[in-house]
Amino acid sequence: VPLSRTVRCTCISISNQPVNPRSLEKLEIIPASQFCPRVEIIATMKKKGEKRCLNPESKAIKNLLKAVSKERSKRSP
């Protein structure tokens, strides 16, 4: 158990709109933990390295995650 019980989530707002995969630098899925009690999906954009938070419950976002993972599996040998 950490000494500090401070919440260390990242996301201020969450979007139901999927981002354009071409604009994506990386897509992180951060599971709930003792530091942040919720799953966070953070899209880091190529422009300025800006971070956008996506709604894990959104159907459109789930479809985006599927598309990205499919694209990754294609690339991996």
Epitope: C9, T10, S13, S15, P37, K48, E50, C53
Partner: antibody, heavy 118, light 110 residues
């Protein structure tokens, strides 16, 4: 359409407390971070505080830290600002504003006036 | 503390073009997005530019935003000035969990 309506302003003595409310409608309140921004009479805009969509993250301007508390009730689509130990320099119009992402404030309410006077 | 500095006031004639600057005190203004808000007398602010150069759909294309890294400044340009453009304009950015506004620029349309 997006609507933000602030209330709770009024005249208060230095050292006393006041709670402002901001009623939101026309969008999914529980998906958006929300800000309070203030404007002293004849002066510019000053950011006060922000709260994340679920209330787990709160950040404050140094000028209000330890005295003001931002909170929200997503079941009521309402944002709050609890202001304690009020000072003359806290007198301002207080606006609530929506945060569509980490950076911008895209919709603003019309504001509520707080006067701190003995 | 990071600050954004704007000219106190600018004035120009109808039909002309005016540019309002917003200069960052430290770091690189280009590393975070800059927004611009218009505030007419007695009204709440409204967004005219977001993410450096993006315009909300209801804002006319006479309004444009840009960033100049060499001078560490952002600019709001309004072309074809109209009397209804007379207002206060504020730039805003974000640095390490603080949202920062410029001091505001009063635009007078002569």
């Amino acid at each position: 359409q997006v609507q933000l309506v602030e209330s709770g302003g009024g005249v208060v003595q230095p050292g006393r407390s006041l709670r402002l409310s901001c009623a939101a409608s026309g969008f999914t309140f529980s998906s958006y971070g929300m800000h309070w921004v203030r404007q002293a009479p004849g002066k510019g805009l000053e950011w006060v505080a922000v709260i994340s969509y679920d209330g787990s993250i709160k950040y404050y301007a140094d000028s209000v830290k330890g005295r003001f508390t931002i909170s929200r009730d997503n079941s009521k689509n309402t944002l709050y600002l609890q202001m304690n130990s009020l000072r003359a320099e806290d007198a301002a119009v207080y606006y609530c504003a929506r945060a569509p992402d980490g950076h911008q404030l895209d919709y603003w309410g019309r504001g509520t006036l707080v006067t701190v006077s003995s | 503390n990071f600050m954004l500095t704007q000219p106190h006031s600018v004035s120009e004639s109808p039909g002309k073009t005016v540019t309002i600057s917003c200069t960052g005190s430290s770091g690189s203004i280009a590393s975070n997005y800059v927004q611009w808000y218009q505030q007419r007398p007695g009204s709440a602010p409204t967004t005219v530019i977001y993410e450096d150069d993006q315009r909300p759909s209801d804002v006319p294309d006479r309004f444009s935003g840009s960033i100049d890294s060499s001078s560490n400044s952002a600019s709001l340009t309004i072309s074809g000035l109209r009397t209804e453009d007379e207002a206060d304009y504020y730039c805003q950015s974000y640095v390490s969990s603080k949202w920062v506004f410029g001091g505001g620029t009063k635009l007078t349309v002569l």
